[in-house]
Interface confidence: low
Amino acid sequence: KKVVLGKKGDTVELTCTASQKKSIQFHWKNSNQIKILGNQGSFLTKGPSKLNDRADSRRSLWDQGNFPLIIKNLKIEDSDTYICEVEDQKEEVQLLVFGLTANSDTHLLQGQSLTLTLESPPGSSPSVQCRSPRGKNIQGGKTLSVSQLELQDSGTWTCTVLQNQKKVEFKIDIVVLAFQKASSIVYKKEGEQVEFSFPLAFTVEKLTGSGELWWQAERASSSKSWITFDLKNKEVSVKRVTQDPKLQMGKKLPLHLTLPQALPQYAGSGNLTLALEAKTGKLHQEVNLVVMRATQLQKNLTCEVWGPTSPKLMLSLKLENKEAKVSKREKAVWVLNPEAGMWQCLLSDSGQVLLESNIKVLPTWSTPVQP
């Protein structure tokens, strides 16, 4: 008995071939011997089966001795043994129809779980293997679960159902709702304008929700809400903003915040959360601000950084075009009695400069000693 696998909602074509390459009488029946369709001369006739309005054949093939049964908009309950009677012969075809669906919305938040459920006909024992867009294979029986979805899981999941050594393939598009970056760090000199951007890793027709940026300044004992906002059809409107600092927010996506001045008291870490309408859970993006200040006070040239710097970062003070005078894995370095010239304060990681601030040291004129 030939086995054919079909997909719920699809169309399947069951073949039936006569040895004579001409149009002869044929009938398709189900396992209960109920006629589905056949021919009467060059006309298609239909029987009283439940498939009536979904069954068809290809009359253009009859002259070649081919009498297919076409079933449209397949249902799981169409799974059956179909019998083609032609030339006093019976050809049996077992049709097994499967369906694969995501048990929830196909738009899921990063970190959530995806469950795929297989609908299968009674008596079948299929196995399912799914391959995620990043190439991860998962397998199971009637259900497959993937916990902790990641951004790379966005895209087309290819699932193969195996039954009787036959395969049928399903493709399910999954959108993982997340920010493009989980974390970012901005390095700024004191006084510079700071731009924070929070691009989303997905696009949807309508995007509605609300968000907030909480900020933990390095110098502060507790975090505070810097700004809250609403998102309606991709339009951003500010609900509440602190007076210090007074952030500005762009009116369109991507979410964009401007801090007028980078100051040591603002250096620290923030967490932008975005709650989307009709979704449980929130999207998160961490943002870090490192601020540098170079100052000269009397005979002391000092360079300091504030904010979340790694212990492997190097802070250096050097006179332009000369070797570094001081270079330490510290958040503050200084030079006593610096010579005149343009000094550079550098924050670097493995030789790559992350932040640079220049300060000019003027010559000090000593009073001539009287003879």
Partner: antibody
Framework: QVQLVQSGAEVKKPGASVKVSCKAS????????ISWVRQAPGQGLEWMGW????????GYAQKFQGRVTMTRDTSTSTVYMELSSLRSEDTAVYYC???????????WGQGTTVTVSS | DIVMTQSPDSLAVSLGERATINCKSS????????????LAWYQQKPGQPPKLLIY???TRASGVPDRFSGSGSGTDFTLTISSLQAEDVAVYYC?????????FGQGTKVEIK
């Protein structure tokens, strides 16, 4: 039945880069990942990495991290594999293969011979 | 990475006789939840790309003659050519695809005695 057609043989000097193309025809380009496998003269098969032409996602073997880059052009149904900082031991036949849903390779390109010689 | 070791390195068999190639993996490639062995066998003739013969350790790929069969489970696998034909002269490779990176055996050369 999908077919994979690769670009022609290349001769390169040590330190140079090579970019091999793999064009899919006769099937849906984005349905399967494409893996790259190389074979040095008289040697066995070595997996280099894969790319999902649909999403652009890639995964590289640790040995080739930093030297290999896989890209795709969906408009021409072509996947590219670029290997940089070539050395003599990179002399090999480079194959692209359709990475089946399970991870076996039912369809292979004809292979591209890359010779690295000073 | 999983290491695949084939034996023997080469094999000479008379036409019509049985040829057996073994493949051992450094760790199991059997998925217990799926009850499938993630192992494939390939045939490679000179100047040609490899050709998939067997997947899931024992399932013949489309168009592969039934004289080729695969068996084994866990870490030990066998490719059998029940009656060697002249066109079967080639190098045969096993490959695991249970984990990334997928890895191949070193190959077994089959010749006619």
């Amino acid at each position: 039945q999908v077919q994979l057609v690769q670009s022609g043989a290349e001769v390169k000097k040590p330190g140079a880069s090579v970019k091999v193309s793999c064009k899919a025809s006769g099937g849906t380009f984005s349905n399967y990942a494409i893996s790259w496998v190389r074979q040095a003269p008289g040697q066995g098969l070595e997996w280099m990495g894969w790319m999902n032409p649909n999403s652009g996602n890639t995964g590289y073997a640790q040995k080739f991290q930093g030297r290999v880059t896989m890209t795709r052009d969906t408009s021409t149904s072509t996947v590219y594999m670029e290997l940089s900082s070539l050395r003599s031991e990179d002399t090999a036949v480079y194959y692209c293969a359709r990475d089946d849903d399970y991870g076996d390779y039912p369809v292979w390109g004809q292979g591209t011979t890359v010779t690295v010689s000073s | 990475d999983i290491v695949m070791t084939q034996s023997p390195d080469s094999l000479a068999v008379s036409l019509g006789e049985r040829a057996t190639i073994n493949c051992k993996s450094s760790q199991s490639v059997l998925s217990t939840s799926y009850n499938k062995n993630y192992l494939a066998w390939y045939q490679q003739k000179p100047g040609q790309p490899p050709k998939l013969l067997i997947y899931w350790a024992s399932t013949r790929a489309s168009g592969v003659p039934d004289r080729f069969s695969g068996s084994g489970s866990g870490t030990d696998f066998t490719l059998t050519i029940s009656s060697l034909q002249a066109e079967d002269v080639a190098v045969y490779y096993c490959q695991q695809y249970y984990t990334t990176p997928p890895t191949f055996g070193q190959g077994t050369k089959v010749e006619i005695k």
